[in-house]
């Protein structure tokens, strides 16, 4: 469960994150599992540990093996394992399956290809992108931040996409490449008038004074990518940001896509330390898209504490 596969090419940078997470203040020790030898933290070493990250600058085939990371806090230790494999560079164009990151699929309306693992590196734009080893050229291809956008996607756009970037460590530059497959699906999307799944219209939500309360506004809009679709909360007909009560905040929930393909959105309203005056407010869950606006109103009522007297 706490073991992670990582791979890279010789003479390229490889950075691996410890599969066990901890606060930034926790110390992380790294070991080479076969020898139980500690990985140094000094940056002058080709392979060194830097907190949660293990850096191979650059990597060598001989670095392959299992590395142990131990996250140490004042109260506990957590152990994780990084299974690292460094491969020799291929002379031909083919990228073998074992070097491929997860496949992504796109459609005419949504064609972003993210460069895998790039967040671990200190890189600067622009990224270089290749398809089946050919540099991508033409206005249909746009490298933006850490992803590639393809305009007007066609079935011929399916294939293996490689991103190439430079990692900078203390003034030294190291090349990194990562490849993933892109498939094109025929997305027959549609858009509907919003349907609010929760809360029910005129729902009464019981809350306890002094406690925290959460209200979830959930709505579905159709199938596929939706335009101008949103769910949000209003208080007494006012945007949360304009209402000016710091105890009451809204937080985006999951962008859901159910097995039936419906595109749905959640927005959670968090009320900290519920006060009497909160019971007087009108809470509106709003769902909107191109077709219109639907509104469900909720009111809060005081939950009576259970009477423990006989």
């Amino acid at each position: 469960k706490f073991s992670k596969q990582s791979w890279g090419l010789e003479n390229e940078a490889l950075i691996v994150r410890c599969p066990r997470q901890g606060k930034p203040s926790y110390t992380v020790d790294w070991y080479y599992s076969q020898t139980n030898k500690s990985i140094p933290t000094q940056e002058r070493n080709r392979v060194f540990a830097s907190g949660q990250l293990l850096k191979f600058l650059p990597a060598a085939v001989a670095d392959s093996g299992i590395y142990t990371c131990i996250v140490r806090s004042p109260t506990f230790n957590r152990t994780g394992y990084a299974n690292v494999t460094i491969y020799k560079k291929q002379s031909d164009c083919n990228v073998p399956d074992y070097l491929m990151y997860s496949t992504v699929s796109g459609s005419e309306k949504n064609s972003k290809i993210y460069c895998p693992t790039i967040d671990l590196y200190n890189w600067t734009a622009p990224l270089e992108w290749f398809k089946n080893c050919q540099a991508l050229q033409g206005s249909r291809y746009r490298a933006h931040k850490s992803f590639l956008v393809i305009d007007n996607v066609m079935t011929e756009d399916a294939g293996d996409y490689t991103c190439k970037f430079i990692h900078n460590e203390n003034g030294a530059n190291y090349s990194v490449t990562a490849t993933r497959s892109f498939t094109v699906k025929d997305e027959q999307g549609f858009s509907l008038f919003p349907v609010i799944g929760a809360p029910a219209q005129n729902e009464i939500k019981e809350v306890e004074i002094g406690k925290n309360a959460n209200l979830t506004c959930s709505a579905c809009f159709g199938k596929g990518t939706q335009f101008l679709a949103a769910v949000l909360w209003q208080l007494n007909g006012t945007k949360i940001t304009d209402f000016g009560e710091p105890r009451i905040q809204q937080e985006e929930g999951q962008n859901q896509s159910f097995s039936n393909g419906l595109a749905c959105l959640d927005m959670v309203l968090r009320i900290a330390d519920v006060k009497e005056e909160d019971l007087l407010l009108q809470y509106d869950c709003l769902a909107l898209n191109l077709h219109g606006l639907r509104r469900h109103t909720v009111r809060l009522s005081r939950k009576n504490p259970i009477d423990h007297h006989s």
Partner: antibody, heavy 123, light 108 residues
């Protein structure tokens, strides 16, 4: 008389960003949706994206996704369009255009236009 | 995306004559979602027709729109000097909202 007043012409270098403003005078700004449409020299009209200021929600044509940001300030009745990573092909007149809200919802045609802002991208 | 194709690219008409402009959509759109605009050199577009056939406020009766499905028409019954301009159709049935490439109506 409702008007959409746009900011002045801009000359920009490739790779830079431009931010164009569109101020609504008269009428109720919060009851409009504002879209941005551009027109390259001698070319047709191209829709870029739309914002509904009342809800603070914006969305964009996929061609411009990641490169354009549309915002609105209800207090000044002003909408903004920022386009980054400019290239010579972005040389165009940029229009803001209004969609009015009827009793049911927004009518997504453009019933009022600003006079346009010429953005020239040149090294 | 829905591609809007206008024809002809240029239409030469004498003042007082009738002009018929065509707009074809690459897929069927409800007639409620088609608009026509007029644009004169150096000016912003101006809304003429929405919902395929409803004239916008202040638009003279000589402008009329018709059509449904994929075929739409803008008719100017008797061209006035101020009508010589470029005309664009636009679908707002589904995003991205798209415009035709325009028809230029010029004096014959």
């Amino acid at each position: 008389q409702v008007q959409l007043v746009q900011s002045g012409a801009e000359v920009k270098k490739p790779g830079s960003s431009v931010k164009v403003s569109c101020k609504a005078s008269g009428g109720t700004f919060s009851s409009y949706a504002i879209s941005w449409v551009r027109q390259a020299p001698g070319q047709g009209l191209e829709w870029m994206g739309t914002i509904i200021p009342m809800f603070g929600i914006a969305d964009y044509a996929q061609k411009f996704q990641g490169r354009v940001t549309i915002t609105a300030d209800e207090s000044t009745s002003t909408a903004y369009m920022e386009l980054s990573s400019l290239r010579s092909e972005d040389t165009a007149v940029y229009y803001c255009a209004r969609s009015s809200r009827s009793s049911s919802w927004y009518n997504w045609y453009f019933d009022l236009w600003g006079r346009g802002t010429l953005v020239t991208v040149s090294s | 995306e829905i591609v809007m194709t206008q024809s002809p690219a240029t239409l030469s008409v004498s003042p007082g004559e009738r002009a018929t402009l065509s707009c074809r959509a690459s897929q069927s759109i409800s007639s409620s979602y088609l608009a026509w605009y007029q644009q004169k050199p150096g000016q912003a577009p101006r809304l003429l027709i929405y919902g395929a056939s409803t004239r916008a406020t202040g638009i003279p009766a000589r402008f009329s729109g018709s059509g449904s499905g994929t075929e739409f028409t803008l008719t100017i019954s008797s061209l006035q000097s101020e009508d010589f301009a470029v005309y664009y159709c636009q679908q707002y049935y589904t995003t991205p909202w798209t415009f035709g490439q325009g028809t230029k109506v010029e004096i014959k």
